[in-house]
Interface confidence: medium
């Protein structure tokens, strides 16, 4: 992946636009596709003014380790539908993208430098365990995904994209 | 229940300072949960966000980019209170200013929601 | 600067449903409020990150965010519902901007 191709705004407004295209075409998060069973995500609130005065190593292993979790619940959804009597369609193209996203998503940020932040010397402090929850249906997937997207990970690379600019 | 009360002029002259105060009950103005924030309403420019304080073990504020060569918010921990202060006013500056709080750490976007709101103060910048 | 953009004003008849639209760059990707405002009271906040209700507002209010538009839904509209709506977002690192604000008229 080119350099920094990430901090062009509309590359990462892509992949949310698209993580809520596919949060619209479950029929809403009350009567949309239930998963079979409960997929452990990671938590998307943001406390923007803590966030804020985080430092950039901090954020890179919220964003690194949610990253890492996501992919592995929508993994786990593909699983769950491929193991369902008839999938459908749409959702099963919806599940697809979200794991060649997360995939473009996660080369970026290794071009980024995020996987850098994450060498933390063995003096430091170990960061905080990450706040998950657990999810019942497709279209809360689908929202987690959107809101990871354009909560921690938008704030995230807004920072270091600004600080390379410097 | 969280409640602002907000007091002040409602006059001031051109190049003057606009001071207002907003006065907290039911939370606590250093809260580590809360945000405290500025917002004033004209005509012309419709509502307008101006800055924001908070207490995170320390004080922090953000101030809109409009407006920050001018603008202070400053807490007031013994009176449970925060101000705004805004220099060198013009008539352009006429508007009803609000005091409102916002609760960081909520659902995604509700740490920007401004939940509850004092009820204005009209000031006229006017010789 | 951002720009949210509203239409002046939106007209119902009272029990049909109301739809006000707040447009912006690409606002799909960010988090989007409501707020309702009487004449002579402050704004109250009636939609939060795009589609979620406070505690106190009816399930009527509701509200969806994609592309380039939000859009705030008041269902089985009453005559109390008429008051101007104004949406809003931090669009930005640290500004939050407002829509120009929408007029609601109930007619009859």
């Known amino acids: 992946a080119p350099p920094r191709l990430i901090c062009d705004s509309r590359v990462l407004e892509r992949y949310i636009l698209e993580a809520k295209e596919a949060e619209n075409v479950t029929m809403g998060c009350a009567e949309g596709p239930r998963l079979s069973e409960n997929i452990t995500v990671p938590d998307t609130k943001v406390n923007f003014y803590a966030w804020k005065r985080m430092e950039v190593e901090e954020q890179a292993i919220e964003v690194w380790q949610g990253l890492s979790l996501l992919s592995e619940a929508i993994l786990q959804a593909q699983a769950l539908l491929a193991n369902s009597s008839q999938p459908p369609e749409t959702l099963q193209l919806h599940i697809d993208k979200a794991i060649s996203g997360l995939r473009s998503l996660t080369s970026l940020l290794r071009v980024l430098g995020a996987q850098k932040e994450l060498m933390s010397p063995p003096d430091t402090t170990p960061p905080a365990p990450l706040r998950t929850l657990t999810v019942d249906t497709f279209c809360k997937l689908f929202r987690v995904y959107a809101n990871f997207l354009r909560g921690k990970l938008k704030l995230y690379t807004g920072e270091v994209c600004r600080r390379g600019d410097r | 229940q969280v409640q602002l009360q907000q007091s002040g002029p409602g006059l001031v002259k051109p190049s003057q300072t606009l001071s207002l105060t907003c006065a907290i009950s039911?939370?606590?103005?250093?809260?580590?949960?809360?945000?405290w924030n500025w917002i004033r309403q004209s005509p012309s420019r419709g509502l307008e966000w101006l800055g924001v304080i908070y207490y995170r073990s320390k004080w922090y504020n953000d101030y809109a980019v409009s407006v920050k060569s001018r603008i202070t918010i400053n807490p007031d921990t013994s009176k449970n209170q925060f101000s705004l202060q805004l220099n060198s006013v013009t008539p352009e500056d006429t508007a009803v200013y609000y005091c409102?709080?916002?609760?960081?750490?909520?659902?995604?976007?509700?740490?920007?929601?401004?939940?509850?709101w004092g009820r204005g103060t009209l000031v006229t910048v006017s010789s | 600067s951002y720009v949210l953009t509203q239409p002046p004003s939106v007209s119902v008849a009272p029990g049909k449903t109301a739809r006000i639209t707040c447009s912006g760059d690409n606002l799909g990707t960010y988090y989007v409020e409501w707020y309702q405002q009487k004449p002579g009271q402050a704004p109250v906040l009636v939609i939060y990150d795009d589609s979620d209700r406070p505690s106190g507002i009816p399930e009527r209010f509701s509200g969806s965010n994609s592309g380039n538009t939000a859009t705030l839904t008041i269902s089985r509209v009453e005559a109390g519902d008429e008051a101007d709506y104004y949406c809003?977002?931090?669009?930005?690192?640290?500004?939050?901007?407002f829509g120009g604000g929408t007029k609601l008229t109930v007619l009859g």
């Open positions: 809003a977002s931090f669009a930005s690192w640290s500004d939050s901007v």
């Open positions: 039911g939370d606590s103005v250093s809260s580590n949960t809360a945000a």
């Open positions: 409102a709080r916002s609760v960081p750490g909520g659902d995604p976007g509700l740490e920007h929601a401004f939940a509850y």
